[in-house]
Amino acid sequence: LTCLGGFASPGPVPPSTALRELIEELVNITQNQKAPLCNGSMVWSINLTAGMYCAALESLINVSGCSAIEKTQRMLSGFCPHKVSAGQFSSLHVRDTKIEVAQFVKDLLLHLKKLFREGQFN
């Protein structure tokens, strides 16, 4: 089971619920986006394959001072089995390609929706 939610979370959340909540948060970000997300900060693009939750977190954790994605960062940490800190990079990063956080979120959102549709929650 994936354990997600706030610090006051009563217990483990079923993986399907955890994924749905992450999707909901990314939808909120895309819907509420007025000015450029995170002031147009750029992050490393990632390969959306196995291990992409950690890779996504490794990319987004390098964006500081952006409250809009803090909850996403926390939620992604619940899907990643190891501790991630700024400056850490995995082989899943497309190291020659940087994209805006807004595009990163959009790409991640679509991929997560496909995983949800296919019943791949972990």
Epitope: S16, I23, T30, L48, K113, K114, F116, R117, G119, F121
Partner: antibody
Amino acid sequence: QVQLVQSGAEVKKPGSSVKVSCKASGFYIKDTYMHWVRQAPGQGLEWMGTIDPANGNTKYVPKFQGRVTITADESTSTAYMELSSLRSEDTAVYYCARSIYDDYHVDDYYAMDYWGQGTLVTVSS
Amino acid sequence: DVLMTQSPGTLSLSPGERATLSCRSSQNIVHINGNTYLEWYQQKPGQAPKLLIYKISDRFSGVPDRFSGSGSGTDFTLTISRLEPEDFAVYYCFQGSHVPWTFGQGTKLEIK
């Protein structure tokens, strides 16, 4: 606007192969699933399989496994369905269709919302 | 495989009447994610099918509100509240919850 344009009618010999194309416009195929459905003359619809063009992952109906190959080329926004070892009962109209999501809903899988015009494949000796 | 069975095979009605088309699945078609991917398609002769309803009861954009879907588990219904001349066609239910995804055999709605 959204369009799926399929290749033209084909007449094939038993035992041969056919490859039908489906050119998409008005959307990015990587954002979708692309499906193939066939319909024999006077019969109902039969789902054959699907591909996620973003990663090439496919799902096939077991009865077609090993005979059907669904591929997609993101660069040309085209999906393909190849059926091998053709027999007379493969004579049918073959349709491509897409399923898409939007950014603004949590759970917005739109089923097969747009379809190609169909490609008649006739298998005859 | 999930077998989708539609009834009746043919339904003869007049414009203005209410049509009720039934679809039954051989097993529960709730997806592991909690959704039920039950869809209805309309097909007219010589044309590609058109999506009417997805996830049991969600009407696709542009579909008139006289079309409605209902049901749960294994029993599903497409209702056309007041038949218009253009509604006479073949209707297929489809399940996209369990691979391989499957269509029903179709119900032909004809003018009485």
